[in-house]
Interface confidence: low
């Protein structure tokens, strides 16, 4: 192993290297958690996945699938690889010195390659307030349904909330009389009425398609996943970036919290969740336009998203 | 595997000095990184210094100047000089070894370190 990385870092790989690939930018105060999820290739289900720390000198292993370490108390990262392409990362208690650049990666068949790679922000502790607020998140964790719903980034100005909230409130009232006028329409006219809820999904500007980041209070590992988390749904396919690597530790190593595994379907492109506090979702209701009194039902479209985090 | 012994642990006057080591055994060869953590009561384990095989000694900001770390390849282990101890430094101080990622890493059981004033 060593000497193949050797090579490689003689011989350097095809493809683009470590520099290319921006990192996603994620912040999250001191004492919350991340929580990460790359997207590898089925081809790649047995081979090892590592989350690593990018020095100068490499990248350094924090937490590895190959083994099962028994660290003592004091853990802070911990990685589970559910199958089926899916590799989850959460990282605890997060303190000043985590600020910095990560990655997920995979020794597959054509060797090592970043799945993803994350620049961690740090900022300085919330205000007791803000902290019971994440921290109403903290039992939760995340499933991944076809629509899903996106909170505020935790890193926006505190002063644009009132004004979102506003403007979620205004929207909300206006859908929901649309929705309660067409129910009337649709009743005076003795027809039958299908209805289909959906969630609205929505995306966050700046963000690089990526890993799913789950951002809470709480100190543990993640357990059952829940639909009312707020997260966001970003959809571009994984760049794989070929590298060499060395180690270099800063952290604990890791146990492995349990989760479902996904179904075992392609590789999903990676995604991206901040969650800061509690949202509430508005429903949107489509009458149904069957004559035979059948509901239809399409999925809400997610505008398109082109964005790319600005350096 | 990687069995990993600490020694050199006890009870110090503040401003005084202790000097840790390390012993690794086992499937030695592919140690990486060794490394010292600790952990005070209440508080979460930290890096205190480590050292790559051909690399330089990293130390935490609180070690610097103080705390010195150096590690004999041939024989597996790493010691840690502390100098000018303080009562912050009280604390339960582990032995770390990372191997290469394939492999994993591997601690020590710990080896208590009491700063009096």
């Known amino acids: 192993m060593g000497l193949t990385l050797l090579l490689l870092l003689l011989l350097g790989l095809e493809g683009q290297g470590i520099v290319g690939s921006l990192p996603e930018v994620l912040q999250a105060p001191v004492g919350s958690s991340i929580l990460v999820q790359c997207h590898y290739r089925l081809q790649d289900v047995k081979a090892q996945k590592v989350w690593c720390r990018f020095l100068p000198e490499g990248c350094q292993p924090l937490v590895s699938s190959a083994v099962d370490r028994r660290a003592p108390a004091g853990r802070r990262t911990f990685l589970t690889d559910l199958g089926g392409g899916l590799l989850q990362v959460e990282m605890v208690t997060l303190q000043e010195e985590d600020a910095g650049e990560y990655g997920c990666m995979v020794d597959g068949a054509r060797g090592p390659q970043i799945l993803h790679r994350v620049s961690l922000n740090i900022l300085p502790p919330e205000e007791e307030e803000e902290t019971h607020k994440i921290g109403s998140l903290a039992e939760n964790a995340f499933s991944d349904p076809a629509g899903s719903a996106n909170p505020l980034e935790p890193s926006q100005d505190e002063k644009s909330i009132p004004l979102i909230w506003g403007a979620v409130l205004l929207v909300g009232l206006l859908v929901a009389a649309v929705v309660l006028f067409a129910v009337m329409a649709k009743r005076k006219q003795g027809n039958r009425l299908g209805v289909c809820g959906r969630f609205l999904s929505s995306r966050v500007s700046g963000m690089n398609p990526s890993s799913v980041v789950h951002h809470v209070s709480d100190s543990g590992p993640a357990a059952e996943l829940p639909l009312d988390v707020p997260h966001i749904r970003l959809d571009s396919p994984p760049s794989f970036d070929n590298t060499t690597y060395t180690s270099l530790p800063l952290d604990s190593p890791s146990g492995k919290p349990s989760l479902p595994a996904p179904s075992s379907l392609p590789p999903l492109p990676p995604k991206v969740l901040v969650c800061s506090k509690p949202v509430t979702y508005a429903t949107v209701i489509f009458p149904g336009g069957n004559k035979g009194g059948g509901t239809s039902c399409g999925p809400a479209q997610n505008p398109p998203n082109n964005q790319t985090p600005s350096s | 595997q990687v069995q990993l012994v600490e020694s050199g642990g006890g009870l110090v006057q503040a401003g005084g000095s202790l000097t840790l080591s390390c012993a690794a055994s086992g499937s030695t060869s592919g140690i990486n990184v060794m490394a010292w953590y600790r952990q005070a009561p209440g508080k979460q384990r930290e890096l205190v210094a480590n050292?790559?095989?051909?690399?330089?000694?990293k130390y935490a900001d609180f070690a610097k100047g103080r705390f010195t770390i150096s590690r004999d390849n041939t024989k597996n282990t790493i010691s840690l000089q502390m100098n000018s101890l303080k009562p912050e430094d009280t604390a339960v101080y582990y032995c770390?070894?990372?191997?290469?990622?394939?492999?994993?890493?591997?601690w020590g059981q710990g080896t208590q370190v009491t700063v009096s004033s």
């Open positions: 050292k790559a095989r051909g690399g330089l000694p």
């Open positions: 770390n070894a990372l191997l290469d990622w394939r492999l994993g890493d591997y």
